[in-house]
């Protein structure tokens, strides 16, 4: 949905959320291009790209929340994700540098689509909260009330370490979106009925 416009159709909105989370759990859209661009696409280096425990809520945690709490948690987490993606983007090579080093410009374009995609998802989360008459949700363009600040990566001059931290974050993000998709797939066909 375009920012600020909300569908009144529950099943269409849920379908959009399901579609967005389906696409955002796909590592070929974010993690894989990041690994290639950052020169981590070597078996020994890939082994170091593991999800940091506790960086994202677990599927079990998400399943334990009601619809309202789930949407609030998702909204807050997506706020943190936006901060981290902005940070990652600042450290990406420029298009001309990519071409010189023979890397794929499409990978950079995929990475640059990540934030608009998250904003689109966040808008639909806000719309769903409105549809479920959830007055506690804040506008999608603002930080959520009580939203924890994004975890600040440990200051380090080690460029390689920063690349690995970005890689771990993205792996966790894809896993989180997979969990979110599984929760949405269990939502019922009407806004006032949940099958958990």
């Amino acid at each position: 949905a375009a920012m600020g416009s909300c569908s009144k159709e529950y099943r269409m909105l849920l379908g959009q959320l399901q579609k967005q989370t389906d696409l955002m759990q796909d590592t070929s859209r974010l993690l894989d291009p990041y690994i290639r661009i950052q020169g981590l696409d070597i078996p020994k280096l890939r082994e170091h790209c593991r999800e940091s425990p506790g960086a994202f809520p677990s599927e079990e945690t998400l399943r334990g929340l009601g619809r309202r709490g789930f949407l609030q948690t998702l909204n807050a987490t997506l706020g943190r994700v936006l901060h981290r993606l902005a940070d990652l983007e600042q450290h990406l090579p420029k298009a001309q540098d990519l071409e010189r080093s023979g890397l794929n410009i499409e990978d950079l374009e995929k990475l640059q689509m990540a934030r608009p995609n998250v904003l689109g998802l966040r808008n639909n989360v806000y719309c769903m909260a409105q549809l479920l008459d959830n007055s506690d949700m804040t506008e999608p363009t603002k930080a959520g009330r009580g939203t924890p600040q994004p975890p600040t990566p440990t200051p380090t001059s080690d460029v390689f370490q920063r690349k690995l931290e970005g890689c771990s974050f993205l792996r966790g993000y894809h896993r989180f979106m997979h969990s979110v998709g599984r929760v949405f797939s269990k939502w019922g066909e009407s806004p006032n009925r949940s099958r958990r």
């Epitope: 949905a1 375009a2 416009s5 569908s7 009144k8 159709e9 099943r11 269409m12 849920l14 379908g15 959009q16 399901q18 579609k19 967005q20 389906d22 696409l23 689109g120 949405f184 797939s185 019922g188 066909e189 009407s190």
Partner: antibody, heavy 120, light 106 residues
């Protein structure tokens, strides 16, 4: 393999009713949403209605008062009851399947269609 | 409802050429879907989620775009590609189709 076969079309007078059927095979209607989409002769495609795996329905507002979508899970068959038919309802009516169990409003498998002609 | 406008209405090309079909929405949409329809046949899904090839679709087909403007490209036309192509959205209710672009042999 996954297949949809429509039937029930034909020539009908304005104001009369008709019921279309769509027999599904290779998948269960309890797992997927299935839609009706129509195409007037020489024209484009127009979404009519959907029935989701749990039985909930959604309609194009243009047809909501006259058309009813339903299904019989035991027969794995979809229906479209069309009342108060008009000449402008003349079209090929296709049933089409959503690609997975989510609420996806696009279509990965289509039937061959059944022609409805409304004429006096 | 969102109105999708396809251009051109008819495109005349020869086999081996590149076809570029456009679809413009009256409002922004999240994803676009493309179908191919041959005379007397049902439509067939070609592209889902703007740029993903549907199952069994050859790689000469590709999709791109965002917001209100989307494109279907057929890179190296084969004789069997001459047909009518429709775009479709479901970002806004109800789902709607474009009026179609007829791709004919020059």
């Amino acid at each position: 393999q996954v297949q949809l076969v429509e039937s029930g079309g034909g020539v009908v007078q304005p104001g009369r009713s008709l019921r279309l059927s769509c027999a599904a095979s290779g998948f269960s209607l309890t797992n997927y949403g299935v839609h009706w989409v129509r195409q007037a002769p020489g024209k484009g495609l127009e979404w009519v209605a959907v029935i989701w795996r749990g039985g909930s329905t959604d309609y194009n507002a243009a047809f909501m008062s006259r058309f009813t979508i339903s299904k019989d899970n035991s027969k794995n068959t979809l229906y479209l009851q069309m009342n108060s038919l008009r000449a402008e309802d003349t079209a090929v009516y296709y049933c089409a399947k959503s690609p997975n169990s989510n609420f996806y409003w696009y279509f990965d498998v289509w039937g061959r269609g059944t022609l409805v002609t409304v004429s006096s | 409802e969102i109105v999708l406008t396809q251009s051109p209405a008819t495109l005349s090309l020869s086999p081996g050429e590149r076809a570029t079909l456009s679809c413009s929405g009256s409002s922004s949409v999240s994803y676009m879907y493309w179908y191919q329809q041959k005379p007397g046949q049902a439509p067939r899904l070609l592209i889902e989620d703007t740029s993903n090839l549907a199952s069994g679709i050859p790689a000469r087909f590709s999709g791109s775009g965002s917001g209100t403007d989307y494109t279907l490209t057929i890179s190296n036309l084969e004789p069997e590609d001459f047909a009518v192509y429709y775009c479709q959205q479901w970002s806004s209710y109800p789902p709607t189709f474009g009026q179609g672009t007829k791709l004919e042999i020059k």
